[in-house]
Structures are given as C-alpha cells and as structure tokens.
C-alpha cells in the first residue's frame, strides 16, 4: 500500500490510500489530501465525524471543512509527538454543536482557529484556555472566526448564548494576544461587560450581522491597537457620548457602521456633530435615518439641530424582538 | 445550574454593623458584575450598588455610599456587603444579583432579612 | 438620579384577560429598560431586558415595547400563576432605578 505523501510528491494533493499499517508519522489520513510541499492537509466535505488521529506532524495548515464532527473533545488534536507545526485550523461546517474544554491543548503553534458556521449549542468556558485556573498559559491564537457560531432556537440550553460565548473569549485571559476576533451574524443582542477590556491586543473586530441594541456598556477604552470595527447590520438606535468619546480616542481605529436603524430625534444630536467632525467612520455619507418616519432615509450628515427633536413616543417598528 | 445563596437573617442593635455574604455557584464568578438591591417591607426595590469581581472596582448609588462597602472573594465565589451604623431604616431585605445582560440582573439570591432593633 | 414613574399601582384582572403596564422615565433612557416579577415571598425574576427582548425561558404571553422616555409591559392573556408584583428598571445611568411596582391580584 502506497503512502500518500511521504516526502516530496508531485503532485500538490494526494488523495490517501486505505493502510492496514500502522499509520507512518508522515501518513495521509483516510479521505484527507496532503502535501508536504505546501505543509498542508484537507480533509473537506468527507462527512467525517471525528479528527483523524494519524494527521502528519509536518501539517502547518489543516482543513476539516464540510464534515460531521458533532463534538470535539478535550485533546481532539493531541497527538505524540504533537502537531507542533499546526498554525491554522479551519473547522469551519462540521456540524459541530459542542466544543469542550482543552480542545485545542497541545498545539503550540496554533494561531488562525475558525469555527464558522457550525451551530454550537456547547463552547466550553475552558475551549480556548484550556484550564480552569483563573489565569492560564497564554494561548498562542492570533485570529478567532466565528462567524454564524449561533444555534437553532430549539438547540440552544437554558443560557445566554451571549454569556456562554462571552465566557470562552476572557477565560483564564488566555486570549490576551488575539488580533483578529470575528463573531458576525449571531443574533448578540449585547456584549457582556469587559469582555473586551480582557482582549487588549486587538486589532480587528467583526460584531457585524448581529442583533446589538446598544453599545452603552461596552468599553473600547482598552482597545489601543484596533484598527478595524465592524458594527453594520445591527440594531443601533443611537450612539452616546460614552461611546463617541471612547472611539475618537482610539488612533488607529476605523468604524463601519452602516446599516443599523438610526433613531434621528433630540437624542441623535451628539452623535451628528460628531460623524461631522469624525475621520473614524468610514462611509459615513452613507448613514440614514430610519425613524421617526418623518426623517426615514434622511442622511445624517445633512441634519442640523433643528431637524432632530423628540416626539413623545416611537412607533412599534422600532422594537427589536 | 446558578444559584446564589446568601447568608442567614440578622437582628442587630442601632449603631451595629452587619456584613451579609452571597455564595455564587454554576457560572464563572468573575465574568459578571453583582448587584446588591434593597426591599423595605412592602416597598419597591432600591439598587445598592455593583462590585465587579474581576478586579473588585465598585459602582455605588449616592445614597448608600457611607452605608455599605462591597467586597469579593474570588477564591470562594463569594461577594459581601457590609452594612454599617445601622438604624431601623435599614431593616429591609436585601437582595444579591448577577448581572446578565449589561445592567439587568438575571439571578438572584433569595434575600437576607436585616432587622435592626433594641 | 432617573426616576421611574409606573403606573397603575394595583390591578385587579381575571384569567385571560390583556394587561398593560405603564413606565415613564424622568428622562431619557434610550432602551435600557428591564421588567422584573416578584412572586410572594420570592426573590424578582427578570423576565424582559432591553425593552422589549425576552429572558431565557419567559412564555410570550409577556411583551415590552417603547423608547426614551415611554415604556408599555403587556401580558397577553393573564394566567393565574402570573399574579405577582411587576417593576421596571432604568439600567442607562447610575444609580439604576426601579419603578414603584405594580401589584396584579385577581378579582
């Protein structure tokens, strides 16, 4: 029986050759392609339901797209000797549902892990820490996607899903070097306090395609490094002086915030003057008023004092639930 | 499953002090502001103040700012409020509470009754 | 410091009737808003976050609704478990404030 990518093939991707051998360090796993060359593995839409344990130790890039994996359990990736090349992960579409604590221990090199767009009624606390301990080893992730990581309604457990994801972010401060954070389209309706204040390096951050009501009390103020803020496609009414003053103080940041049902009555007076003056926005020409009905589709740079008063009641559209 | 259970009924006299403990269990203490709220017999409720128990930086309502001093423990999941130079306006029941969306307390303990008398 | 005007202060309903709580901010509190219910004898239970979002497990029987200043909390069709005292709260600026309650009982 042939190996499929021990040393340097020719081709870049081997499909794998079924072995009734004990697996090689160097081996492709069933239904998975490889190549050495490219330090890379892809095991993509075989309805996998769980991580091949005979990965090759030279895989740098791993992809376990399009499977069936249902839950990933503590030291999913550990081998002996470990993956200490594995940098980036994508299990992206695998069904997952439930992700517990250590599923990612004994990958030291991990930086890139993306979990997009598997319905996870579990993440574990500890999934990214690794431990409970109140401080942990630093986690050595640099980039965490998980976009569309919400649940059916009938799936989710009597908790927030907010909290439960909130919980994995800032546990044991494991993820203190995490650049990129991409959590869009997930029905938040708010962050949990600090959860920022606990992810300092921060360069990137996509809330997009989420269901925020309110920035009120979420702290940018920590946020030193970030360069890019995705808040489009939420339902944000308003953004207060808190808020402004936090943003403008950020040096390098740029704020996306189309999209989003701006409320244009007395209260909207700050945050005008503000967008007027602002370099931080980026499309700000682009910002509409969507209530009261009397000011729907105005821009809001064109609105001055007079145009933004306050009626003693909004109509039921508004509501957000 | 969450629980916060707090500690005993307290009959004190005048002028003493108090300090009534609220034990957190099922969900990770240090990732949500507690609240502690008071009930006067009959009456609304009155929002005492918050404690983050991350770092123990407190958030109080005027009102109480001289009356009580909130605390963590970490180690034990546990957060205190002292109340301090007690009178009979003070007797009530008070009430610790987990925040779960930012502001709205979405657990609580089942109260400690504090009845200041001679 | 805000203070939460809640009206009325007491309400005799029968099962299956519709019931309307009223909520009026002393000023601006955009839609930090939040429902409470307090069983006798029993610690309140928050059943709607901001304005309008139902908390995990609350039937939805239970709405809220309104902006800035003005807040309705309506159950659709009384039961009799649902007899309790209902407060709001403002969570927008501290102090955060508490309504005076209003008390359902049954006719």
């Known amino acids: 029986t042939s190996s499929a990518s021990s040393s340097s093939s020719s081709a870049p991707f081997l499909a794998s050759a079924a072995s009734a051998q004990p697996p090689l360090p160097d081996q492709c796993p069933a239904l998975c392609e490889c190549s050495e060359a490219a330090r890379t593995v892809k095991c993509v839409n075989r309805n996998l339901t769980e991580v091949p344990t005979d990965l090759p130790l030279y895989v740098r890039n791993l992809f376990l797209t399009g499977n069936q994996l249902a839950v990933l359990p503590a030291g999913a990736f550990a081998r002996r000797p470990p993956l200490a090349e594995l940098a980036a992960l994508n299990l992206s579409g695998s069904r997952l549902d439930e992700v517990r604590g250590g599923a990612f221990e004994h990958l030291p090199s991990l930086r890139q892990l993306d979990l997009s767009h598997n319905p996870l009624a579990y993440l574990s606390p500890f999934a990214f820490s690794g431990s409970n301990a109140s401080i942990s080893a630093p986690s050595p992730l640099v980039e965490l996607i998980l976009n569309h990581i919400v649940p059916p309604d009938d799936k989710r457990q009597n908790r927030s899903f907010e909290g439960m994801v909130a919980a994995a972010l800032v546990a044991g401060r494991a993820l203190q070097g995490l650049h990129l954070l991409e959590l869009a389209s997930n029905h938040f309706l708010y962050l949990p306090r600090d959860v920022l204040a606990q992810l300092p390096s921060l360069r990137y951050l996509d809330l997009s395609n989420n269901s925020l009501v309110s920035l009120t009390y979420v702290s940018f103020r920590n946020l030193t490094h970030l360069e890019s803020l995705h808040l489009e496609d939420n339902a944000l009414k308003v953004l207060h002086n808190g808020t402004l003053a936090e943003l403008q103080g950020l040096p390098h940041v740029r704020v996306f915030l189309d999209n989003n049902p701006w409320v244009c009555d007395c209260h909207m007076a700050d945050m005008v003057t503000w967008l007027k003056q602002t370099g931080v926005v980026q499309g700000k020409d682009r910002l509409t008023c969507a209530f009261p009905e009397k000011m729907r589709n105005r821009v809001l740079l064109e609105l001055n004092s007079a145009d933004l008063d306050c009626d003693p009641i909004l109509p039921p559209s508004l509501q957000t639930s | 499953q969450v629980q916060l259970q707090q500690s005993g009924p307290e009959v004190v006299n005048p002028g003493a002090s108090v300090k009534i403990s609220c034990k957190a269990s099922g969900y990770t203490f240090t990732d949500y502001y507690m609240n502690w709220v008071k009930q006067s017999r009959g009456k609304s409720l009155e929002w005492i103040g918050d404690?983050?128990?991350?770092?123990?930086?407190?958030n109080y309502n005027q009102k109480f700012k001289d009356k009580a001093t909130l605390t963590v423990d970490k180690s034990s999941n546990t957060a205190y409020m002292e109340l301090r130079s007690l009178t009979s306006e003070n007797s009530a029941v008070y009430y610790c509470?987990?925040?779960?969306?930012?502001?709205?307390?979405?657990?609580w303990g089942q109260g400690t009754s504090v009845t200041v008398s001679s | 410091n805000i203070v939460m005007t809640q009206t009325p202060k007491f309400l005799l309903v029968s099962a299956g009737d519709r019931v309307t709580i009223t909520c009026k901010a002393s000023?601006?509190?955009?839609?930090?808003v939040a429902w409470y219910q307090q069983k006798p004898g029993q610690s309140p239970k928050l059943l709607i976050y901001y304005v309008s979002n139902r908390y995990i497990g609350v039937p939805d029987r239970f709405t809220g609704s309104g902006y800035g200043t003005d807040f309705t909390f309506t159950i659709s069709t009384v039961q009799a478990e649902d007899l309790a005292v209902y407060f709001c709260q403002q969570v927008y600026s501290s102090p955060f404030t508490f309504g005076g309650g209003t008390r359902l009982e049954m006719k």
């Open positions: 000023q601006s509190v955009s839609n930090h």
């Open positions: 404690i983050n128990p991350n770092n123990g930086g407190t």
């Open positions: 509470a987990k925040e779960g969306p930012p502001g709205a307390m979405d657990y």
